[in-house]
């Protein structure tokens, strides 16, 4: 098909982060077209010669795909017609980090938008009471982080207190020699209090909470990506 008009179409991306070894999504939406056959999606990465992915005439066109992405990319083919050009990236690698461009051609015109994709490792921490310790101790563990994060303890009762003197954090390299297991121990824990173990790097922030009372132990954890913004 040909583009006869002089219009540019709106393309929108969202910065995101990929967890090494897992699947990731590079988000991109555009003004939809009526005919799927009139839509071309091209994903590019700065510094890479070949295409990351190309979708045209209703199917993948991978003849110009760069070898570093071979077998690792897919668009949501059934959602292209409604303006979803997002890319699924399988088995995210550290080297996938960088600037990507989502380039769209339709019968209405063309448009493109860039997105920054960060890669690293992040996981939920779990906080437990360490019954093997000589004193009341909490142990915070998270299996996979990269780059090396910071670990900070906080407590509901002693708000603003600095626990660095009564805690010890270690980082153990995992078998794939990139990510690390995070272990932090908090000593001199008092009962009837809620403690938080906060793990953070430039990609994600995760918190593990534990509430210790005479009768029960309650745990809660959550993880937030730091760079997801439009």
């Amino acid at each position: 098909f040909g583009i006869s008009g002089r219009h540019s179409i709106t393309v929108t991306t969202v910065a995101s982060a990929g967890n090494i070894g897992e699947d990731g999504i590079l988000s991109c939406t555009f003004e939809p077209d009526i005919k799927l056959s009139d839509i071309v999606i091209q994903w590019l990465k700065e510094g890479v010669l070949g295409l990351v992915h190309e979708f045209k005439e209703g199917k993948d066109e991978l003849s110009e795909q760069d070898e570093m992405f071979r077998g690792r990319t897919a668009v949501f083919a059934d959602q292209v017609i409604v303006g979803n050009a997002s890319l699924r990236l399988k088995n995210v690698q550290l080297t996938d980090a960088g600037t990507y461009k989502c380039y769209i051609i339709t019968s209405k015109g063309k448009g493109n938008a860039n997105l920054e994709y960060k890669t690293g490792a992040f996981s939920m921490p779990e906080v437990n009471v360490d019954y093997n310790a000589s004193s009341e101790t909490l142990r915070c563990e998270a299996p996979r982080w990269f780059p090396q994060p910071t670990v900070v303890w906080a407590s509901q009762v002693d708000q603003g207190a600095n626990f660095s003197e009564v805690s010890n954090t270690s980082f153990e390299l995992n078998s794939e020699n990139v990510t690390m297991k995070v272990v932090s121990v908090l000593y001199n824990v008092t009962i009837n209090n809620t403690y938080s173990c906060m793990i953070e790097n430039d990609i994600a922030k995760a918190t593990g909470d534990i509430k210790v009372t005479e009768s029960e132990i309650k745990r809660r954890s959550h993880l937030q990506l730091l760079n997801s913004k439009a």
Epitope: G2, V40, L44, E46, G47, E64, M68, N112
Partner: antibody, heavy 117, light 105 residues
Framework: EVQLVESGGGVVQPGRSLRLSCAAS????????MNWVRQAPGKGLEWVSA????????YYADSVKGRFTISRDNSKNTLYLQMNSLRAEDTAVYYC??????????WGQGTTVTVSS | SYELTQPPSVSVAPGKTARITCGGN??????VHWYQQKPGQAPVLVVY???DRPSGIPERFSGSNSGNTATLTISRVEAGDEADYYC????????FGTGTKLTVL
């Protein structure tokens, strides 16, 4: 300031070899693909070769394929063009240029290669 | 292989508008870039992605691209705009147009 400075040009006999260098500064060199572009005397621009940021992938114009090799040393922020089996028609000013998506946003000042017996 | 055709020369009076065309099969579906080259100097990017301007390039330079023709428009032409202009697309390599010499009368 982003800068590209070519060197290594000169006069060489047909069939001989020459290696051009391009020193890059002012940007994260390893994250950008790079190009060599040439311009014969009184002629237009002709793309020669491109290399990915990591150096793992390269493309060549048909006119130089099998004779020229593009490479890079990211630890030295330097781009190279090894030119073998040189011909008279390879006489040109050779520019290195930083690739930006589908185009080139920064160019060096060029280095002159003359192939003559 | 993909070919881009430009007129060899375009002449324009100072203060007027110059239009330089770049023809290619369905070029409207490609991203077109324009370079200015003055004698003895390296090319300079003046328009990228059809119509965007790099920082430092005057607003007088604009571009459009549709169908089989991309156009570089220079409004209020100045003597300093006299140069060779090249269009360029990517097609498994950089493809340059034949070049247009802009003469300011």
């Amino acid at each position: 300031e982003v800068q590209l400075v070519e060197s290594g040009g000169g006069v060489v006999q047909p069939g001989r070899s020459l290696r051009l260098s391009c020193a890059a500064s002012g940007f994260t060199y390893s994250s950008r693909a790079m190009n060599w572009v040439r311009q014969a005397p009184g002629k237009g621009l002709e793309w020669v070769s491109a290399i990915s940021g990591s150096g793992s992938n390269a493309y060549y114009a048909d006119s130089v394929k099998g004779r020229f090799t593009i490479s890079r040393d990211n630890s030295k922020n330097t781009l190279y063009l090894q030119m073998n089996s040189l011909r008279a028609e390879d006489t040109a000013v050779y520019y290195c240029a930083r690739k930006r998506w589908y185009g080139m946003d920064v160019w060096g000042q060029g280095t002159t290669v003359t192939v003559s017996s | 292989s993909y070919e881009l055709t430009q007129p060899p020369s375009v002449s324009v009076a100072p203060g007027k508008t110059a239009r330089i065309t770049c023809g290619g099969n369905n070029i409207g579906s490609k991203s077109v870039h324009w370079y200015q080259q003055k004698p003895g100097q390296a090319p300079v990017l003046v328009v990228y992605d059809d119509s965007d301007r790099p920082s430092g390039i005057p607003e007088r330079f604009s571009g459009s691209n549709s169908g089989n023709t991309a156009t570089l428009t220079i409004s209020r032409v100045e003597a300093g705009d006299e140069a060779d202009y090249y269009c360029q697309v990517w097609d498994r390599g950089m493809i340059f147009g034949t070049g247009t010499k802009l003469t300011v009368l």
